[in-house]
Interface confidence: low
């Protein structure tokens, strides 16, 4: 029985050319996290495997940094980065948990700073 829940940063906005943190957290389960996948729509951005460590997809390696935690930092944002991002937690014995984040990249003069994710 899957009892866990995924908390995410939800819907966020950021300025073109800036950086943003995508963060998910799995709670309410004692299941062991074996791997976390980060995907943008149908593209794999990065994997963090409990045994093998991080792998960043080659097409994103210049703009994606691991962390904080099991999250991702996206840099040099463009309007094309707007869209859905998914954190996929592979766990044992529960199975797979998925969280969704929607990122909107705005022109600098329009971005709402208050909507940007702040690390507590």
């Amino acid at each position: 029985m899957m009892t866990g829940t995924i908390e995410t940063t939800g819907n966020i906005s950021a300025e073109k050319g800036g950086s943003i943190i995508l963060q998910c957290h799995l709670s309410s389960t004692t299941a062991q996290v074996t791997q976390v996948n980060w995907e943008q729509q149908d593209q794999l951005l990065a994997i963090c495997n409990a045994d093998l460590g991080w792998h960043i997809s080659p097409s994103f390696k210049d703009r994606v940094a691991p962390g904080p935690g099991l999250g991702l930092t996206l840099q040099s944002l463009t309007v094309n980065d707007t869209g859905e991002y998914f954190c996929i937690y592979h766990t044992y014995p529960d199975g797979t948990y998925t969280g969704r984040i929607f990122l909107e990249v705005l022109e600098s003069s329009v971005a709402e700073h208050g909507a940007r994710f702040q690390i507590p």
């Epitope: 957290h25 996290v33 963090c48 495997n49 409990a50 045994d51 460590g53 991080w54 691991p66 962390g67 904080p68 935690g69 099991l70």
Partner: nanobody, 113 residues
């Protein structure tokens, strides 16, 4: 729970250098990531640099060529060598690992003449 202890901050003149250390203890996720963030007064916390177990490194554009991140995996310790410091580098510096929540108490770096 992971415990993170940062050290090495202080007051330095523009153009000077500092080396920050971050020691991690407790249950760490074995991906081997450690990173540094900073928060200047009145600003959001921002990412500075990251290092993986395999030695891969990433830097924010604002510190590229001036800061060097490294890690000693046997000691679960990350370092941030900061050279050619500028007044705008003044901030509380925090380290993180790939365990959650994973934030230390921070160490203050002040760059001023």
């Amino acid at each position: 729970e992971v415990q993170l202890v940062e050290s090495g901050g202080g007051l330095v003149q523009p153009g000077g250098s500092l080396r920050l250390s971050c020691a991690a203890s407790g249950n760490t996720f074995s991906g081997g990531f450690m990173g540094w963030f900073r928060q200047a007064p009145g600003k959001e916390r921002e990412w500075v640099a990251s290092v993986l177990r395999g030695g891969y490194t990433w830097y924010a554009d604002s510190v590229k060529g001036r800061f060097t991140i490294s890690a000693d995996n046997s000691k679960n310790t990350a370092y941030l060598q900061m050279n050619s410091l500028k007044p705008e580098d003044t901030a509380v510096y925090y380290c993180t690992t790939d365990s959650l929540p994973g934030w230390g108490q921070g160490t203050l770096v002040t760059v001023s003449s």
